[in-house]
């Protein structure tokens, strides 16, 4: 069963996914897709990284964390009810059948009528829970069970990132962005550097 995350219509949703690079800058390709993780790749790919950079993304999907340190958690901007469903994070570790697959279920609730929103509400309200058990089903489907161990310092750091998410929003298209500018555009919603 998938680990469940919640967000309200109009919020940004946060889906956590992490790995530990073998060495700084020694990155592993990662893909995010809509739909449960298939045997290869990520179903309908919405974002991917290669060994160096984010080389493909679609509108509203981006990485807020430091993906160069293995934080490949997905942010979905301004969610609607149509964003509900299962998402796949796949860590494409080279070798023979080495991929790590995580299925995450996003539940979108209708927006509540509330006073002016606080900064905290940019992401799903609570820090997402994490599992520490490792699961291996017959179909190799794993939920968040295979995440690397995360220590309290990392959790604190990530919690700060969540709290400062509006600042991160403001920064993401500045010099600190990890989105980059595309070599070309397929259309207004898709941006990628070719993977060769």
């Amino acid at each position: 069963s998938e680990v469940e995350y919640r967000a309200e219509v109009g919020q940004n949703a946060y889906l956590p996914c992490f790995y530990t690079p073998a060495a700084p800058g020694n990155l592993v390709p990662v893909c995010w897709g809509k739909g449960a993780c298939p045997v290869f790749e990520c179903g309908n790919v919405v974002l991917r990284t290669d060994e160096r950079d984010v080389n493909y993304w679609t509108s509203r999907y981006w990485l807020n964390g430091d993906f160069r340190k293995g934080d490949v958690s997905l942010t979905i901007e301004n969610v609607t009810l149509a964003d509900s469903g299962i998402y796949c994070c796949r860590i494409q570790i080279p070798g023979i059948m080495n991929d790590e697959k995580f299925n995450l279920k996003l539940v979108i609730k209708p927006a509540k009528v509330t006073p002016a929103p606080t900064r905290q509400r940019d992401f799903t309200a609570a820090f997402p829970r994490m599992l520490t058990t490792r699961g291996h089903g017959p179909a190799e489907t794993q939920t968040l069970g295979s995440l690397p161990d995360i220590n309290l310092t990392q959790i604190s750091t990530l919690a700060n990132e969540l709290r400062d998410s509006r600042l991160a929003n403001d920064l993401r298209d500045s010099g600190a962005t990890i989105r980059g500018s595309s070599d070309y555009k397929d259309d207004d919603d898709k941006h990628h550097h070719h993977h060769h």
Epitope: A36, N44, Q92, P94, G95, I96, D99, G137, P138, H195
Partner: antibody
Framework: EVQLVESGGGLVQPGGSLRLSCAAS????????MAWVRQAPGKGLEWVAN????????YYLDSLKSRFTISRDNAKNSLYLQMNSLRAEDTAVYYC???????????????WGQGTLVTVSS | DIQMTQSPSSLSASVGDRVTITCRAS??????LAWYQQKPGKAPKLLIY???TLAEGVPSRFSGSGSGTDFTLTISSLQPEDFATYYC?????????FGQGTKLEIK
């Protein structure tokens, strides 16, 4: 037009080796996972192996991974299957097939070669 | 491994008939299912992918449905060229697995 053309099949003795090749054309080869699927005479289809775009990740039927190696050469638009320690039960037509592309979405073997027959017999 | 079970194993039908072949997965495979047609001495041909999407160039009399564990391939009005063997195949778990095949013969 997408074309996949296998070669390298033939008669080999048990314990022997063969290297199958698949020449691809009509599409950007490096944008797709590729696969080998086999079919023993009069039997159904059996997946053998898959390889990702650049060859860094491979996937095998468990019972074959110690004897078979899938590889690719994107510069030559070619896919390979090295088969060692061949057994009579490896006798089959071996097909090269194009699998999922770089942006996902289409999960099925959309294009197949004509197949090459491997016969393992003494 | 995920087992794929097709039924029936064989069936006889006439031109113009509506035919349904079913495929059951031993585990949830969501919609990662493909259907293939194979004629003697030929390579398989993709008919349907992602459980219900018609592959390029495939006539609209073919359709697929289902998700999770139960899937169907329907041929709305059999044509002479449709007599062949049909296979389902899952793309969800490793190893990729095929059904045992359904041989569609002329009555």
């Amino acid at each position: 037009e997408v074309q996949l053309v296998e070669s390298g099949g033939g008669l080999v003795q048990p314990g022997g080796s063969l290297r199958l090749s698949c020449a691809a054309s009509g599409f950007t080869f490096s944008d797709y996972y590729m696969a080998w699927v086999r079919q023993a005479p009069g039997k159904g289809l059996e997946w053998v192996a898959n390889i990702n775009y650049d060859g860094s990740s491979t996937y095998y039927l468990d019972s074959l991974k110690s004897r078979f190696t899938i590889s690719r050469d994107n510069a030559k638009n070619s896919l390979y299957l090295q088969m060692n320690s061949l057994r009579a039960e490896d006798t089959a037509v071996y097909y090269c097939a194009r699998d999922v592309g770089y942006y996902g979405g289409n999960y099925g073997f959309a294009y197949w070669g004509q197949g090459t027959l491997v016969t393992v017999s003494s | 491994d995920i087992q794929m079970t097709q039924s029936p194993s064989s069936l006889s039908a006439s031109v113009g008939d509506r035919v349904t072949i079913t495929c059951r997965a031993s585990d949830n495979i969501y919609s990662y299912l493909a259907w293939y047609q194979q004629k003697p001495g030929k390579a398989p041909k993709l008919l349907i992918y992602n459980a219900k999407t018609l592959a390029e160039g495939v006539p609209s009399r073919f359709s697929g449905s289902g998700s999770g564990t139960d899937f169907t391939l329907t041929i709305s009005s059999l044509q002479p060229e449709d007599f062949a063997t049909y296979y389902c195949q899952q793309h969800y778990g490793s190893p990729l697995t095929f059904g045992q095949g359904t041989k569609l013969e002329i009555k």
